[in-house]
Interface confidence: medium
């Protein structure tokens, strides 16, 4: 039986307002609203917390029965939809111990884990996985790219008691490995031997000058020479114009700087590798993954352009359950959501074309009006009648 520590799908209308607490640390935090956005798969099921004010910090959190993940898997999962075509802003969650004062949550409040997408300009489009280890926030050493389109995406972090982890986007693995290898939690296992140094006679040159090679006698030629085909102009007056000098051209026989040919160095020993020794500072920590206490999930973000929707939060100890929950929520809605968006885009294209037509017709009509004003008044008769009357256009 999976343990579900926290689950939030916002299916009870305004009920979320009693479960989620706004921080009062700053008076101008942005407001979250319940919305399924401009397009969705299911208007009710796809309602989530949406950021609603541009260029704001957001700080909202929900508490749950405190638990420890010691000796068990931890799965953190949620959906994020940047339907505003986000330019710069966070889409991540933070897991806090239950000691957090939710009404005072802010950017520097100490958390256990931070996980989720972060986008800012073309340079930052990454999934953060940050662990607080012994009071320090430690960032992953790998670059995990997040989704940067307008659709809903499912983000999953799995942390196992064997100190391995997995990051999934849309229920597909995008990164995995060991906590020890992919974060700098511990000092390195090996260090360079401080007592070892490169021998003075160690030759790292793969090639050397050929000592038998010498410069040919006819090598040195000037780079530029007077143009032999140039002729002094007939009207050149030495008294008036000074002494005539032919223009200079590139010397075709110029060979540049001479360099001796290269040969293999008979004394070459290769690149010297500094020998390593076991680091006396290193000691393994089998409980990197473990936290004594999780009690609050928080959204502590900055967004330039608002509109992001967070939904389908889940904290559990069961990977299979999380995957199934993801398929039942995000998995069910994604196709219909895309269909609705495509339909809206098509309508927008049609509207743009219609606007262009309206403008064209307005211009056409204005020209007609102008012509009518400029031309002399004449009877409003059909062409056939006009021709019968012998009337012809001026």
């Amino acid at each position: 039986e999976p343990a579900v520590y926290f689950k939030e799908q916002f299916l009870d209308g305004d009920g979320w307002t009693s479960r989620w607490i706004e921080s009062k640390h700053k008076s101008d935090f942005g407001k979250f609203v319940l919305s399924s956005g401009k397009f969705y798969g299911d208007e009710e099921k796809d309602k989530g917390l949406q950021t609603s004010q541009d260029a704001r910090f957001y700080a909202l959190s929900a508490s749950f029965e405190p638990f420890s993940n010691k000796g068990q898997t931890l799965v953190v999962q949620f959906t994020v939809k940047h339907e505003q075509n986000i330019d710069c802003g966070g889409g991540y969650v933070k897991l806090f111990p239950n000691s957090l004062d939710q009404t005072d949550m802010h950017g520097d409040s100490e958390y256990n884990i931070m996980f989720g997408p972060d986008i800012c300009g073309p340079g930052t489009k990454k999934v953060h996985v940050i662990f607080n280890y012994k009071g320090k926030n430690v960032l992953i050493n790998k670059d995990i790219r997040c989704k940067d389109d307008e659709f809903t995406h499912l983000y999953t972090l799995i942390v196992r008691p064997d100190n391995t982890y997995e990051v999934k986007i849309d229920n597909s693995q995008v990164e995995s490995g060991s906590l020890e290898d992919d974060w700098d939690f511990l000092p390195p296992k090996k260090i360079k031997d401080p007592d070892a140094s490169k021998p003075e006679d160690w030759d790292e040159r793969a090639k050397i000058d050929d000592p038998t090679d010498s410069k040919p006698e006819d090598w040195d030629k000037p780079e530029h020479i007077p143009d032999p085909d140039a002729k002094k102009p007939e009207d050149w007056d030495e008294e008036m114009d000074g002494e005539w000098e032919p223009p200079v051209i590139q010397n075709p026989e110029y060979k540049g700087e001479w360099k001796p040919r290269q040969i293999d160095n008979p004394d070459y020993k290769g690149t010297w590798i500094h020998p390593e020794i076991d680091n006396p500072e290193y000691s393994p920590d089998p409980s990197i993954y473990a936290y004594d206490n999780f009690g609050v999930l928080g959204l502590d973000l900055w967004q330039v352009k608002s509109g992001t929707i967070f939904d389908n939060f889940l904290i559990t100890n069961d990977e299979a359950y999380a995957e199934e929950f993801g398929n039942e929520t995000w998995g069910v809605t994604k196709a219909a959501e895309k269909q609705m968006k495509d339909k809206q885009d098509e309508e927008q294209r049609t509207r743009r074309m219609m606007r262009t037509k309206m403008r064209m017709r307005r211009m056409r009509r204005t020209r007609r009006k102008m012509r009518r004003k400029m031309s002399p008044a004449r009877p409003r008769t059909s062409c056939r009648e006009a021709c019968l009357q012998g009337w012809t256009e001026a």
Partner: antibody
């Protein structure tokens, strides 16, 4: 002169589909959009949508999206409005209109049909 | 509920002036000069009285005039006549979304 002549009154059952027509004369049919406007009993006017007879492109008001289809037949200079899944609230007079008169701009409707009464009743 | 707000009714005596307001937002009335006014006698087709805020189609008496200030457009009828009694609707074309919106309509009663 420019004229829009609409088809006669219709009585339909809920869930049925109605298709009404609007015959254009007096100007080149493909020159201007044809709009449809609803007036329910005791209510105001509501824009339903438009068709560009030149290429058949349409735009519908959100309220009617999914249930309305507006078409144009250039061979007969006639525009049509079809409303499906009829309900009692669709009981109304439906007008076709166009900015096809001489002096106005294409954002106002200076020529209107006489209206078609559609009654939805079981 | 209509997108544009009009008073439900106004009245005036023959020869007087009346003004009908039409309030929208900066996305419709306030954003563009595409406000029209229609006169609607029951059982007849609506008739265009004003377009592009203040332009009158030919055949419309100059007693009818239009204006706009901010997000509110107005139709003024001076020298009221008995035949002016009708429903009046304002309308706004919104180029940004290629759609038309109408007001809820105003019933004009000419007294006496």
């Amino acid at each position: 002169q420019v004229q829009l002549v609409q088809s006669g009154a219709e009585v339909k059952k809920p869930g049925a589909t109605v298709k009404i027509s609007c015959k254009v004369s007096g100007y080149s049919f493909t020159d201007y959009f044809i709009h449809w406007v609803q007036q329910a009993p005791g209510k105001g006017l509501a824009w339903v949508g438009l068709v560009d007879p030149e290429d058949g492109e349409t735009i519908y008001a959100e309220k009617f999206q999914g249930r309305v289809t507006i078409t144009a037949d250039t061979s007969t200079d006639t525009a049509y409005m079809e409303l499906s899944s009829l309900r009692s609230e669709d009981t109304a007079v439906y007008y076709c209109a166009t900015p096809g008169g001489i002096l106005t701009d294409p954002d106002a409707f200076d020529i209107w049909g006489q209206g078609t009464m559609v009654t939805v009743s079981s | 509920q209509s997108a544009l707000t009009q008073p439900a009714s106004v009245s005036g005596s023959p020869g007087q002036s009346v003004t009908i307001s039409c309030t929208g937002t900066s996305s419709d009335v306030g954003g563009y000069n595409y406000v029209s006014w229609y006169q609607h006698h029951p059982g007849k087709a609506p008739k265009l009285m004003i377009y592009d805020v203040n332009k009158r189609p030919s055949g419309v008496p100059d007693r009818f005039s239009g204006s706009k200030s901010g997000n509110t457009a107005s139709l003024t009828i001076s020298g009221l006549q008995a035949e002016d009694e009708a429903d009046y609707y304002c309308s706004s074309y919104i180029p940004s979304s290629t759609r038309w919106v109408f007001g809820g309509g105003t019933k004009l009663t000419v007294l006496g």
